[in-house]
C-alpha cells in the first residue's frame, strides 16, 4: 500500500529496524549524535528514510513526549515560506523564527524553532517499516 508514492502513509507496519521506534504506522529514529541539517538529511536518506515530516498536530504532540529541551532537526525549511521536505506547507503549527538567516526547522518538547542550518543538532528520521517501501 505504501508503494507508488514517496510521501504516502504506511498502512501495515510490522516491524522497525534496530534502534528505531515504532509509533503508529511509522518508524522513527532519534539520533544520539549531532549533525548540521544537510548531514542529518543525508543520514536519513541513506537509510531509506527522510528527515521527519510531521503530518498534523496529533503526530507532533505524540512525538514531543519523546523530546527534551534539546532541539532536533526535522524535514522543514524556509524557501519563500516554510515547507516540509515532501513539498507541503507548514499549516498546522507556528514556528518560532527570529532571523532571516535561520532557514531550517527544528523541534523540541516545546514546539518548532527556526535555526541556522549549520548548527549541529540531534535529528529525527521517519520511514515506513520493512514490509512497506515509502518514505512516509
Amino acid at each position: 500500500l505504501c508503494q507508488g508514492s514517496n510521501y504516502s502513509t504506511c498502512a501495515s507496519c510490522p516491524s522497525c529496524p534496530d534502534r528505531w521506534m515504532k509509533y503508529g504506522n511509522h518508524c522513527y529514529y532519534f539520533s544520539v549524535e549531532e549533525k548540521d541539517w544537510n548531514s542529518s538529511l543525508e543520514f536519513c536518506l541513506a537509510r531509506d528514510s527522510h528527515l521527519l515530516v510531521i503530518t498534523d498536530n496529533q503526530e507532533m504532540s505524540l512525538l514531543q513526549v519523546f523530546l527534551s529541551e534539546a532541539f532536533c532537526w526535522i524535514g522543514l525549511r524556509n524557501n519563500s515560506g516554510w515547507r516540509w521536505e515532501d513539498g507541503s506547507p507548514l499549516n498546522f503549527s507556528r514556528i518560532s523564527s527570529n532571523s532571516f538567516v535561520q532557514t531550517c526547522g527544528a523541534i523540541n518538547k516545546n514546539g518548532l524553532q527556526a535555526s541556522s542550518c549549520e548548527v549541529p543538532l540531534h535529528w529525527v528520521c521517519k520511514k515506513c517499516p520493512f514490509a512497506d517501501q515509502a518514505l512516509f
Epitope: D36, F71, S96, N98, S99, F100, V101, Q102, A106, N108, Q113, A114, S115, S116, E118, V119, P120
Partner: antibody
C-alpha cells in the same frame, strides 16, 4: 519588529567602572540561537568586538580585554549589560549592542543582523 | 588574530557608476565546517552599521540586488553595480570564522 537601544553614563573618570545597558525588543534573549554582542568604535575609527552572550548565558570575551569585561543579561527584562572596569581615555568610544545569530559556534561565526543606535562614552579627568 | 585588510581606504565614485571594494584576510577564513563566515556591513554617517552580505555572497533581507559579494579563501570583493546616494558611507568586512572575530579598517565610499 526587532530593536536594540544602548544606554550609559555619557561621561566618567579614569579608573571608574563603565556600566552599559542594552534594552531589546522584538525577540527573546532566551530563545535558542539568539545572542547579543557589544562592539565599540572610537570616534572616526573602526569597529572592535568586545563580548557576546548567548541565549543560555554562555559568555565570550575579547581576550585582550577579558580581565576588565563582564557581560550579563536579564531575560525577563529583555536587557543585556556590559561592565568595563578600570577605564581610561582609550575606552572613549561609541558603544553598540547588536543581536547575534548562532551558526553552531559559541565563540565565533555569527551574523550581527540588528544593531542599536549606539551610546557615546567619554572617559575624561 | 586574523587581519582583515580592505582596499581602497577611500573610494570616490560618481552616482550610477560601479564600485568595487576588496577585503583580504591574513589567513584562510574557510571554517572546518566548510562555510566561510565573511560579512559586509555599511555604516552611514551618524548611524550604526547594517548588515549587507553574509557568508560571502548572501544578500541580507531587504538589501538591493545591486550589492553583490564574492570571493573565497582569503580574497573577497563587494561590488555595487550602480551607486546611489544612499550607498555612501563606510563599508566594513568582517570575519567570524576564527576567534577573535575581526573587522576590516573600513572603506569610505564618497562622491567624486
Amino acid at each position: 519588529q526587532v530593536t536594540l537601544k544602548e544606554s550609559g553614563p555619557g561621561i566618567l573618570q579614569p579608573s571608574q567602572t563603565l556600566s552599559l545597558t542594552c534594552s531589546v525588543s522584538g525577540f527573546s534573549l532566551s530563545t535558542f540561537g539568539m545572542g547579543v554582542g557589544w562592539i565599540r568604535q572610537p570616534s572616526g575609527k573602526g569597529l572592535e568586538w568586545l563580548a557576546h552572550i548567548w541565549w543560555d548565558d554562555d559568555k565570550w570575551y575579547e581576550l585582550a580585554l577579558k580581565s576588565r569585561l563582564t557581560i550579563s543579561k536579564d531575560s525577563s527584562k529583555n536587557q543585556v549589560f556590559l561592565k568595563i572596569a578600570n577605564v581610561d581615555t582609550a575606552d572613549t568610544a561609541t558603544y553598540f549592542c547588536a543581536r547575534v545569530i548562532y551558526y553552531g559556534s559559541r565563540s565565533a561565526y555569527y551574523s550581527m543582523d540588528y544593531w542599536g543606535p549606539g551610546t557615546s562614552v567619554t572617559v575624561s579627568s | 588574530d586574523v587581519l582583515m585588510t580592505q582596499t581602497p581606504l577611500s573610494l570616490p565614485v560618481s552616482l550610477g557608476a560601479q564600485a568595487s571594494i576588496s577585503c583580504k584576510s591574513s589567513q584562510s577564513i574557510v571554517h572546518s565546517n566548510g562555510h566561510t563566515y565573511l560579512e559586509w556591513y555599511l555604516q552611514k554617517p551618524g548611524q550604526s552599521p547594517k548588515i549587507l552580505i553574509y557568508k560571502v555572497s548572501n544578500r541580507f533581507s531587504g538589501v538591493p540586488d545591486r550589492f553583490s559579494g564574492s570571493g573565497s579563501g582569503t580574497d573577497f570583493t563587494l561590488k555595487i553595480s550602480r551607486v546611489e546616494a544612499e550607498d555612501l558611507g563606510v563599508y566594513y568586512c568582517f570575519q567570524g570564522s576564527h576567534v577573535p572575530v575581526t573587522f576590516g579598517a573600513g572603506t569610505k565610499l564618497e562622491l567624486k
